[in-house]
């Protein structure tokens, strides 16, 4: 533990996994659910102006894109990859990029991605071949 760091009661809040340094949680876009204009694009920006320090050091960035007959929404949050989100396991939680994967949901089109780089859920990718290009 670094000098003067108090002993933590809750180890989820303090991660010390290399040489005693304490790890800052990830920085993620965190706008919860917002209406989105992202549709039929290979990639999109979240248009979320809020970047939050995640609550726990092991949380990653998540984005959820949903389309139904009424609207399109994009959800941006932090989430623990050990826990499911919307009933689904967070795949590729260690990825530096947020590459959307379609999930089966009745009555809507549902894509979700997770990633573990600063603000990585700001740029969501629907085509894996498109990862090196700039957003539409």
């Amino acid at each position: 533990i670094p000098p003067h760091v108090p002993k933590s009661v809750n180890s989820d809040v303090m991660a010390s996994d290399n040489g005693g340094a304490v790890k800052l949680p990830q920085l993620c876009k965190f706008c919860d659910v917002r209406l989105s204009t992202c549709d039929n694009q290979k990639s999109c920006m979240s248009n979320c102006s809020i970047t939050a320090i995640c609550e726990k050091p092991h949380e990653v960035c998540v984005a959820v894109w949903r389309k139904n007959d009424k609207n399109i929404t994009l959800e941006t949050v932090c989430h623990d990859p050990k826990l499911t989100y919307h009933g689904f396991t967070l795949e590729d939680a260690a990825s530096p990029k947020c590459v959307m994967k379609e999930k089966k949901r009745a009555g809507e089109t549902f894509f979700m991605c997770a990633c573990n780089m600063e603000e990585c859920n700001d740029y969501i990718i629907f085509s894996e071949e498109y990862t090196t290009s700039s957003p539409d």
């Epitope: 670094p2 000098p3 005693g20 340094a21 304490v22 790890k23 800052l24 050091p57």
Partner: nanobody, 119 residues
Framework: EVQLLESGGGLVQPGGSLRLSCAAS????????MAWVRQAPGKGLEWVSL????????YYANSVKGRFTISRDNSKNTLYLQMNSLRAEDTAVYYC????????????WGQGTLVTVSS
């Protein structure tokens, strides 16, 4: 030797304000990210706010966003946390922390300053 010395804590009523300071020495202050972290009684550490070397960007935990403001004066080697609209749940020991220069790791911490929000 790296030293971080927090001050400005105390007892304040709900809705009140406090300004914490952290005087830094022993390293090139204007080259490092700095953060405020707190520990409420019986709880784990909670990261409150982060600031980059030149003062921008700044980041906040959702629990304090819109109420707390982090800033720094590199000419004085000092980090600040302006806390407004304080709530009972903000009661904690507040620590300033220095970025290690690698990954997301912070390696030096102050002794802390106690903030008590109570009527």
């Amino acid at each position: 030797e790296v030293q971080l010395l927090e001050s400005g804590g105390g007892l304040v009523q709900p809705g009140g304000s406090l300004r914490l300071s952290c005087a830094a020495s022993g390293f090139t202050f204007d080259k490092y990210k700095m953060a405020w972290v707190r520990q409420a009684p019986g709880k784990g550490l909670e990261w409150v706010s982060l600031i980059f070397p030149n003062g921008v960007p700044t980041y906040y935990a959702n629990s304090v966003k819109g109420r707390f403001t982090i800033s720094r004066d590199n000419s004085k080697n000092t980090l600040y946390l302006q806390m407004n609209s304080l709530r009972a749940e903000d009661t904690a020991v507040y620590y300033c922390a220095k970025y290690s220069g690698q990954g997301r790791d912070f390696d030096y911490w102050g002794q802390g300053t106690l903030v008590t929000v109570s009527s």
